[in-house]
Amino acid sequence: IIDGYKCKEGSHPWQVALLKGNQLHCGGVLVDKYWVLTAAHCKMGQYQVQLGSDKIGDQSAQKIKATKSFRHPGYSTKTHVNDIMLVRLDEPVKMSSKVEAVQLPEHCEPPGTSCTVSGWGTTTSPDVTFPSDLMCSDVKLISSRECKKVYKDLLGKTMLCAGIPDSKTNTCNGDSGGPLVCNDTLQGLVSWGTYPCGQPNDPGVYTQVCKYKRWVMETMKTHR
């Protein structure tokens, strides 16, 4: 997260880290005791999932292996449309005050809605600085029409934009797959942005979760 702040401890109990060995690979969101939602571009053969801590590499955090993941069938490596994936944990999460599932959206929030995005991604760009603490940024949803003025054809129909005018605050490498939460519901998953990160008036781009609720529910049901 560029130009963000340290999240209030315990305020994001649904936030998970997808680790490759001990290293951060992507963010993710707990949606059920067996399931984590993340970005399709975060796909690996297997994952170590850290839950219940704001500190990356926290020894006291829950760590659960995951060997199965289900990319959206329409994901494109060229256009990055349908950048959404479900990761099935090998064993169920122990729910607590530190580990909770996020609320999936009942509706799509409108432009102008205030939201918070979080992650352990680099806080500087192009030189990288990975924080140990979970970082947050407060952003507002931007209309598709406004965002298309910036990104033109790069912006797909199920992509959601968020940012703050003239501000550098944005997501960056390592934040991918992490949550954009608006009014206590998951509205976005970190997908992409301009590199180097933090170019003013280049919004962060997210997978618009409200457009995928049926796919999420059906995929979890199929692979119970």
């Epitope: 990055h80 033109k152 997908s191 301009t194």
Partner: antibody, heavy 122, light 107 residues
């Protein structure tokens, strides 16, 4: 179809400033998600990235050339420019302008100009 | 800067041969690795992006693989029009850097 075209003098005297302009057609230089780059190739040699500029005006330069390079953009003309000061014979090269799709999850040069040979000689 | 070591620097093969070029990065670059083809007097042309994705319009005989530090570029069946110099390029960190190139000739 995006097209890029370099223009500028083909001969520059040592110690002077090399100035090149790249005109972009078929796409807007103000589009987000792209950077506008200069890359050079010494005769018979490999490729060297010089630097890039964004629609915001942010610039990034190769540290090996940083003290001598300035890249600027003119969005009204859909052009960006390179200035390389205090040139020597070692700056003789084919200079390319190129667009890069430059996102957090993918980065590559997708469109290139045809290149222009700049010779540094008195 | 990240150094990109490409090998071989040149090779000669027959039409129909399988040709393999390797590229090694001096540090982990994930899959931020691209391959370009350059014909004499022309600008480089993108063939493969993100280590393994074929650019639109590029023949399927070209392919790429690898992740981290070691990458491979393959022409499954060399054609006369493939005579060119091929470059790898890392896009993980600025400054972006290129390999030294591999000149491919026909026997």
């Amino acid at each position: 179809q995006v097209q890029l075209q370099e223009s500028g003098p083909g001969l520059v005297k040592p110690s002077q400033t090399l100035s090149l302009t790249c005109t972009v057609s078929g796409g807007s230089i103000s589009s987000g998600g792209y950077s506008w780059n200069w890359i050079r190739q010494h005769p018979g040699k490999g490729l060297e990235w010089i630097g890039s500029i964004y629609r915001s005006g942010s610039t990034y330069y190769n540290p090996s050339l940083k003290s001598r390079v300035t890249i600027s953009v003119d969005t009204s003309k859909n052009q960006f420019s390179l200035k390389l000061s205090s040139v020597t014979a070692a700056d003789t090269a084919v200079y390319y302008c190129a667009r890069a799709k430059q996102l957090t999850l993918t980065r590559y040069f997708d469109y290139w100009g045809q290149g222009t040979l700049v010779t540094v000689s008195s | 800067d990240i150094q990109m070591t490409q090998s071989p620097s040149s090779l000669s093969a027959s039409v129909g041969d399988r040709v393999t070029i390797t590229c090694q990065a001096s540090q982990d670059i994930a899959n931020y690795l691209n391959w370009y083809q350059q014909k004499p007097g022309k600008a480089p042309k993108l063939l493969i992006y993100d280590a393994s994705n074929l650019e639109t319009g590029v023949p399927s005989r070209f392919s790429g693989s690898g992740s981290g530090t070691d990458f491979t570029f393959t022409i499954s069946s060399l054609q006369p029009e493939d005579i060119a110099t091929y470059y790898c390029q890392q896009a993980s960190q600025l400054p972006f850097t290129f390999g030294g190139g591999t000149k491919v000739e026909i026997k």
